[in-house]
Interface confidence: low
Amino acid sequence: MMTGTIETTGNISAEKGGSIILQCHLSSTTAQVTQVNWEQQDQLLAICNADLGWHISPSFKDRVAPGPGLGLTLQSLTVNDTGEYFCIYHTYPDGTYTGRIFLEVLESSVAEHGARFQIP
């Protein structure tokens, strides 16, 4: 039975040209995390594999940095980066846990972080 929950940074906003950290945390399970995928809609941005480490999609090499931890740092943000981001935790023996983050990239200099929330 899948008992874990994913805590994410929730709905967040950031300034155009700036950077943002996408973070997810899996709790309430003893399952082993074998790989974490970071996806934007249907596009794979990066993977962090327990055995083989980090790999960033060639399309995003210049603007995506691994970490901190299992998180992902997006740099040189553009308005086109606005949208849904997913952290997908592949675990054994539980299976897959998915967390959702909505990022809004703002033209203005006012960008506030949303509250953290949980997805069971």
Epitope: H55, S57, P58
Partner: antibody
Framework: EVQLLESGGGLVQPGGSLRLSCAAS????????MNWVRQAPGKGLEYVAS????????YYADSVKGRFTISRDNSKNTLYLQMNSLRAEDTAVYYC??????????????WGQGTTVTVSS | QSVLTQPPSASGTPGQRVTISCSGG????????VSWYQQLPGTAPKLLIY???KRPSGVPDRFSASKSGTSASLAISGLQSEDEADYYC???????????FGGGTKLTVL
């Protein structure tokens, strides 16, 4: 069109050497992990070796470790397999295969037509 | 002997649904992704399923797959004569640090 074309196979005596090549076209070769997989006559698929984008990380099946070397030349869009100390059991069709969707070990989505290696005296 | 275990043969009649199993361990299927390949006689293997359940473009939705624990399965519905081929499962093995394949299943369409 995405294509892989192997070459370099042939007949070689036990203990001999052979170098296989795989010419890639139709995709950005330097973005992908690449693999060699072989198939002995009438048998199933057997993993041989893998290499990461820049050639800095390699993996081998135990059966070829220390004898085979996988390498790549991204400027020539070519994958290589240097095979030394060949044995009769290395006789097989050798396929090069590209990893799917840039990430490693999700699956191999493009395969070459294969090149035949026969080890016999 | 292959690290992943598949039945050597399977068969079905046109229109039928057939399932091919693939059994492994925690270092491969249990902890990593499964892919499936079809090899028609005299040709190179073709990717059917990757990342356990996803189909590359061009692969009919008659082909589907699933995974549970350390086992995986490939299902082919609406069986057609052109489905007669060898089918292989594969997974990365974290202990061996390399790919492992099943021994292959020869599918016969009766």
């Amino acid at each position: 069109e995405v294509q892989l074309l192997e070459s370099g196979g042939g007949l070689v005596q036990p203990g001999g050497s052979l170098r296989l090549s795989c010419a890639a076209s139709g995709f950005t070769f330097s973005d992908y992990y690449m693999n060699w997989v072989r198939q002995a006559p009438g048998k199933g698929l057997e993993y041989v070796a893998s290499i990461n984008w820049n050639g800095g990380t390699t993996y081998y099946a135990d059966s070829v470790k220390g004898r085979f070397t996988i390498s790549r030349d991204n400027s020539k869009n070519t994958l290589y397999l240097q095979m030394n100390s060949l044995r009769a059991e290395d006789t097989a069709v050798y396929y090069c295969a590209k990893d799917q969707n840039w990430n490693f070990y999700y699956g191999m989505d493009v395969w070459g037509q294969g090149t035949t290696v026969t080890v016999s005296s | 002997q292959s690290v992943l275990t598949q039945p050597p043969s399977a068969s079905g009649t046109p229109g039928q649904r057939v399932t091919i199993s693939c059994s492994g361990g925690s270092s491969n299927i249990g902890n990593n992704f499964v892919s499936w390949y079809q090899q028609l006689p005299g040709t190179a293997p073709k990717l059917l399923i990757y990342n356990e359940i996803k189909r590359p473009s061009g692969v009919p939705d008659r082909f589907s797959a699933s995974k549970s624990g350390t086992s995986a399965s490939l299902a082919i519905s609406g069986l057609q004569s052109e489905d007669e081929a060898d089918y292989y499962c594969a997974s990365w093995d974290g202990s061996l640090r390399g790919w492992v394949f099943g021994g292959g299943t020869k599918l016969t369409v009766l």
